[in-house]
């Protein structure tokens, strides 16, 4: 709709709305994956740079996160991943480049990679939500 502000111009109130939508999606995805893939450890080779360092309070770095979810989409719950991607797209700065992410070929490493992304993303959302709730923006 023409009424909507460009996505990179959303106020903290709307960013908070999006985070609130993302939290249960992310939590549910992580819990389901942990139940399905018991015994898979977190990878120490994957680091999701999910927060921007150039803004106060920290902003969700949607452009850095999106490629990871696009990459794991075929290997996880596509329906929920699509909902997460849809929300992340709303937070993305226009014209920010997205890097290509390749998933590890080894099955065990791949599972570990997915688990790590989901865990780091959940923690990241928690961090942004806390910063949006802690007084003036």
């Amino acid at each position: 709709s023409s009424h909507m502000a460009p996505t990179h111009q959303l106020p903290p109130s709307d960013v908070r709305k999006i985070i609130l939508e993302l939290q249960p999606l992310s939590r549910g995805l992580l819990e389901d994956y942990q139940k399905k893939e018991t015994g898979v450890p977190e990878s120490n080779r994957t680091l999701l740079l999910c927060l921007t360092s150039d803004s106060q309070p920290p902003r969700l770095n949607s452009s850095a996160i999106l490629p990871y979810f696009r990459a794991i989409r075929p290997l996880s719950d596509k329906n929920i991943i699509d909902k997460i991607i849809e929300q992340l797209d709303k937070l993305k700065f226009q014209h920010e480049p997205e890097t290509e992410i390749s998933v590890p070929a080894d099955t065990f490493e791949c599972k570990s990679f997915i688990l790590t992304i989901l865990q780091q993303f959940s923690a990241c959302l928690e961090s942004v939500f806390k910063s949006l709730n802690s007084g003036p923006q």
């Epitope: 009424h3 903290p12 939508e21």
Partner: antibody
Framework: EVQLVESGPSLVKPGGSLRLTCSVT????????WKWIRKFPGNKLEYMGY???????DYNPSLKSRITISRDTSKNQYYLQLNSVTTEDTATYYC????????????WGQGTSVTVSS | DIVMTQSPASLSVSLGQRATISCRAS??????????MHWYQQKPGQSPKLLIY???NLESGIPARFGGSGSGTDFTLTIDPVQADDVATYYC?????????FGGGTKLEIK
């Protein structure tokens, strides 16, 4: 044409609960955000909270311990419940639509007047 | 919470003249050059009606005699020329930060 209509009791006893219904036509409550606002005698407006297209709720911290917003998508209705009411909750209650991020509340109900009194 | 201070509380204007209502936010409601400040009109016994969104955008179906301006913390609603149908209470509202807040209202009367 989008229409919102509030309904519920006009008189509630102190200490009781207030439950209001917002019936929506012309749009689905499974898209956008659906808000409650109230206007006190003297015209002060207070934002109360919302339920989203997915059922997520968020409330004004000043009311958080007393407020619940819920919905019934099959009826295209959403609800406001306010517990432990006092005379300070006497107000006209409005429901409103917030259709898009970065926009504003574009459609409001006509409001329903609630008096808290014994 | 962001406090919205509206002035004047009431305003009496002659038909055909200009009405100016001010709203000041206790902190900036701008992000990336957009102001998340809106104006509503409420006539007695009616629901609030959106006039202006994001400080200066005229809502569809609203006459062009209504205008909004301002940024940061200071905003203005202008009605020029005022018509008899404009008798109402006008509210400013910020959707920048939770919880959303409103001004105290300005009651417009005709002289």
């Amino acid at each position: 044409e989008v229409q919102l209509v509030e309904s519920g009791p006009s008189l509630v006893k102190p200490g009781g609960s207030l439950r209001l219904t917002c019936s929506v036509t012309g749009d689905s409550i499974t898209s956008g955000y659906w808000k409650w606002i109230r206007k006190f005698p003297g015209n002060k407006l207070e934002y109360m909270g919302y339920i989203s297209y997915s059922g997520i709720t968020d409330y004004n911290p000043s009311l958080k311990s007393r407020i619940t917003i819920s919905r019934d998508t099959s009826k295209n209705q959403y609800y406001l419940q306010l517990n432990s009411v006092t005379t300070e909750d006497t107000a006209t209650y409005y429901c409103a639509r917030y259709p898009n991020y970065g926009y504003a509340m574009d459609y409001w109900g006509q409001g329903t007047s609630v008096t808290v009194s014994s | 919470d962001i406090v919205m201070t509206q002035s004047p509380a009431s305003l009496s204007v002659s038909l055909g003249q200009r009405a100016t209502i001010s709203c000041r936010a206790s902190e900036s409601v701008d992000t990336y050059g957009r102001s998340f400040m809106h104006w509503y009109q409420q006539k007695p016994g009616q629901s609030p009606k959106l006039l202006i969104y994001r400080a200066s955008n005229l809502e569809s179906g609203i006459p062009a005699r209504f205008g909004g301006s301002g940024s940061g913390t200071d905003f203005t609603l202008t009605i020029d020329p005022v018509q008899a149908d404009d008798v109402a209470t006008y509210y400013c509202h910020q959707s920048y930060e939770d919880p959303w807040t409103f001004g105290g209202g300005t009651k417009l009367e005709i002289k």
